[in-house]
């Protein structure tokens, strides 16, 4: 049982490599987490699977001053075909529903692993 979504290829880097690197970064974050990630900041949740890279970035970009996720933010921007800035609100988000950054990252890792297993690189 899987759920899949597609994304834009991040330039010249093979999509499978880019996705694997993003997964590895999220694994590092979840495994090295000691104190609450980003001081327990909350971000918008997401209610769909399509277009989730831009939606994920739109959520995480609103977290500032958190060095632990800066690389993730940069990597996600490579998967999103349009420019994302803080304060944007996508229809993919669940309005009035926020979750902890740590849970968001954990769930993003779960979803990306599914995509990778199914070969959904573009």
């Amino acid at each position: 049982l899987t759920c899949l979504g597609g994304f834009a290829s991040p330039g010249p880097v093979p999509p499978s490599t880019a996705l694997r690197e993003l997964i590895e970064e999220l694994v590092n974050i979840t495994q090295n987490q000691k104190a609450p990630l980003c001081n327990g900041s909350m971000v918008w949740s997401i209610n769909l699977t399509a277009g989730m890279y831009c939606a994920a970035l739109e959520s995480l970009i609103n977290v500032s001053g958190c060095s632990a996720i800066e690389k993730t933010q940069r990597m996600l921007s490579g998967f999103c075909p349009h420019k994302v800035s803080a304060g944007q609100f996508s229809s993919l988000h669940v309005r009035d529903t926020k979750i902890e950054v740590a849970q968001f990252v954990k769930d993003l890792l779960l979803h990306l692993k599914k995509l990778f297993r199914e070969g959904q690189f573009n």
Epitope: L1, C3, I46, T49, M52, Q103, D107, L110, H111
Partner: nanobody, 118 residues
């Protein structure tokens, strides 16, 4: 934190119907395979039905095939179980849960009691 809250259980006569709901919060519901499990009095826990994240693929235990229907509304972060043609042997506590193989993604609700009796 993560919360799964079941509702809709109760007493119903054999042949009757019930619709269970599970309200999810604290995690990205849309990215999880979800399911319903049940535990009858004095018995072990068994999976009743599982539904994939997008709602396309479903699994049903043989004992409920053709009678139960699982569904989800990702926009409402809610999981459902429509139970028709209920039998005495369906009496159990029904649990809403994530259905992921990955370690660390195991979340369960507190359960809702379904009693089928005349």
């Amino acid at each position: 934190g993560v919360q799964l809250l079941e509702s809709g259980g109760g007493l119903v006569q054999p042949g009757g119907s019930l619709r269970l709901s599970c309200a999810a919060s604290g995690f990205i519901f849309a990215w999880y395979d979800m399911g319903w499990a049940r535990q009858a009095p004095g018995k072990g826990l068994e999976w009743v039905s599982i539904i994939a994240c997008k709602g396309g693929k479903t699994y049903y235990a043989d004992s409920v095939k053709g009678r139960f229907t699982i569904s989800r509304d990702n926009s409402k972060n809610t999981l459902y179980l429509q139970m028709n043609s209920l039998r005495a042997e369906d009496t159990a506590v029904y649990y809403c849960a994530t259905a992921e193989d990955e370690p660390g993604y195991d979340y369960w609700g507190q359960g809702t009691l379904v009693t089928v009796s005349s």
